[in-house]
């Protein structure tokens, strides 16, 4: 396979990585598709240095990034461990709210107006971040 | 000046098989998602597949799903359709389309179309 | 899936009519919906993207409006090479479905 050396068009490189930032929005699963057909994956965060990265480019606004619970425990996109990694949410967050009146709990995590985390329906449609990163094989699959 | 030319298309019988291929020009092929679109005779457009640039990541309709498969050669710049187990309702102008702005699917350029027709 | 229906399913128009067409969305498209241009035997021309915003040498003429789950594409002035079926699509959720088109007939 190839590899990324520069970033696309329109993306933000930073620290080996590179980002795109949505303006409007769309459910956590169409970002998700969204942003895989961009061989990429919703923003994994894994530090507070990256933290402060996307909340200078996001600004105040609900963003989605790549981790969720939708089936069980909290899981990152890209396969970074949850447990030991970083985390940033607001304080008792993440509640896995019912009272929404949507149905069902908060599967899906986002970066709130000051950048801390909460969890939200899954379906809000919200803004997203793209990451992919840099010098990464490409997982293009031979053809028949 | 952007150009996809689709090929491959033709009759076939019921149960069988037929690869379509788009060759692309004008672009930086691999940087960008592509898409097979059809449309059977008298009905309006079915988006039918999609692919990463990079062939990482594909998507199907569940009309077509474990029967069609989607690849690229980004060497060759060239869009692959693989239709395995055609079907009668598989007859349809099938268009290849360039995404226009990232994932979103928007499709800002299109090819002419390859007909296929699955016929005993 | 998102279901498009389109409205009317045929128009018949004069060079120089207004012309409107309706999308209705079965959900909400967060302004995910784009319009086509079909003419037999050429390849489909992307007119509108983003529910408003007009393709790079698409004539003026052509615009788009709507929000929620409701659009509509407007030719201002129809002019002979505008004779053609018009298809919007949303882009918003995978499937991408279209409506099944708006056929612009000489009146």
């Known amino acids: 396979g190839s590899e990324r050396t520069c970033c696309p068009v329109n993306w933000v490189e930073h620290e080996r990585s590179c980002y795109w930032f949505s303006r409007s929005g769309k459910a956590w699963a169409d970002a998700d598709n969204y942003c895989r057909l961009e061989d990429a994956h919703l923003v994994v965060v894994t530090s507070w240095e990256e933290q402060k990265f996307v909340q200078h480019h996001i600004g105040p606004v609900n963003t989605w990034m790549g981790l969720h619970d939708q089936n069980g425990p909290w899981k990152w996109v890209d396969g970074t461990d949850y447990e030991t990694g970083f985390k940033n949410w607001r304080p008792e967050q993440p509640d896995d709210w019912y009272g929404h009146g949507l149905g069902g709990g908060e599967d899906c995590a986002h970066f709130t107006d000051d950048g801390r985390w909460n969890d939200d329906v899954c379906q809000r449609p919200y803004r997203w971040v793209c990451e992919t990163e840099l010098d990464k094989a490409s997982q293009e699959p031979p053809l028949l | 000046e952007v150009q996809l030319l689709e090929s491959g298309g033709g009759l076939v019988q019921p149960g069988g098989s037929l690869r379509l291929s788009c060759a692309a020009s004008g672009f930086t092929f691999s940087s960008y998602a592509m898409s097979w679109v059809r449309q059977a005779p008298g009905k309006g457009l079915e988006w039918v597949s999609a692919i990463s640039g990079r062939g990482g990541n594909t998507y199907y309709a569940d009309s077509v799903k474990g029967r069609f498969t989607i690849s690229r050669d980004n060497s060759k710049n060239t869009l692959y359709l693989q239709m395995n187990s055609l079907r009668a309702e598989d007859t349809a102008v099938y268009y290849c389309?360039?995404?226009?702005?990232?994932?979103?699917?928007?499709?800002?350029?299109w090819g002419q179309g390859t007909l296929v027709t699955v016929s005993s | 899936d998102i279901q498009m229906t389109q409205s009317p399913s045929s128009v018949s128009a004069s060079v120089g009519d207004r012309v409107t067409i309706t999308c209705r969305a079965s959900q909400g498209l967060n302004n995910w919906l784009a319009w086509y241009q079909l003419k037999p035997g050429k390849a489909p021309k992307l007119?509108?993207?983003?529910?408003?915003s007009l393709q790079s040498g698409v004539p003026s003429r052509f615009s788009g409006s709507g929000s929620g789950s409701e659009f509509t594409l407007t030719i201002s002035s129809l002019q002979p090479e505008d004779f053609a079926t018009y298809h919007c699509q949303q882009a918003n959720s995978l499937p991408w479905t279209f409506g099944q088109g708006t056929k612009v007939e000489i009146k």
């Open positions: 007119l509108i993207y983003a529910v408003s």
């Open positions: 389309a360039k995404d226009g702005f990232g994932g979103s699917s928007y499709f800002d350029y």
